[in-house]
């Protein structure tokens, strides 16, 4: 899915009004420094498109965020502010019925979820350049 | 077996209202994230609200303001009550059941925004 046209002030306003909580939330007891970003992403486009990587493919050690709250509204605000973005999306849901894991807290989904904080502030900062 | 079935769709006079409903079994209700999509003539489907089990909520741009989503985790009933309507609401509405590996739908209803 090509991001270019998604409405980015209302993600953004979405992720700063919820999905940031819920990162927040899923990370407690998790300190900040624990965990090295190695993921980024150069403007906003490639963020949401790195964003959506890492939220609902499953990965080894890390089989699936996509039961977790921010997944779900992340799987919602794009939905809603992606034109054509759903339509996507109900053929990949139904692919992923065949690899669905129990929903179990990992050292590596904390990662990974530290990379998507990562990846959403700089989704949050478009015009800072790339360090 | 999941079913969602709506109700509550009808011909209404713009700025009149209306409210759907979203009546759905075989699935603990709570657990998922709750949608109405809807779908003009000719145009794509499009998710106009979203609520979640935590309580908040999501609206496309188009009816912020005039929509309102809520749930009724006891009677596993979702709704949307519509306000305002215009002409461009016209289109049949769609209730989702969305989890991580499939979307479920209803079967639609129809919304007609008419003189």
């Known amino acids: 899915y090509d991001f270019t046209n998604c409405d980015f002030e209302k993600i953004k306003a979405a992720y700063l009004s919820t999905i940031s909580k819920d990162l927040i939330t899923y990370m407690s007891g998790t300190k900040s420094t624990e965990f090295n970003n190695t993921v980024s992403c150069s403007n906003r486009p490639h963020c949401l498109t790195e964003i959506q990587s890492l939220t609902f493919n499953p990965t080894a050690g890390c089989a699936s965020l996509a039961k977790e709250m921010f997944a779900m509204k992340t799987k919602a605000a794009l939905a809603i502010w992606c034109p054509g973005y759903s339509e996507t999306q109900i053929n990949a849901t139904q692919a992923m019925k065949k690899r669905r894991k129990r929903k179990v807290t990992t050292n590596k989904c904390l990662e990974q979820v530290s990379q998507l904080q990562g990846l959403w502030r700089r989704f949050n900062r478009p015009l800072l350049k790339q360090q | 077996e999941v079913q969602l079935v709506e109700s509550g769709g009808g011909l209404v006079q713009p700025g009149g209202s209306l409210r759907l409903s979203c009546a759905a079994s075989?699935?603990?209700?709570?657990?998922?994230?709750m949608g109405w999509f809807r779908q003009a003539p000719g145009k794509e489907r499009e998710l106009v609200s979203a609520i979640f089990s935590d309580g908040s909520t999501m609206y496309a741009d188009s009816v912020k303001g005039r929509f309102t989503i809520s749930a009724d985790n006891s009677k596993n009933t979702a709704y949307l009550q519509m306000n305002s309507l215009k002409p461009e609401d016209t289109a049949v509405y769609y209730c989702t059941r969305d989890s991580t590996d499939t979307r479920y739908w209803g079967q639609g209803t129809l919304v007609t925004v008419s003189s």
């Open positions: 075989g699935f603990t209700f709570s657990s998922y994230w």
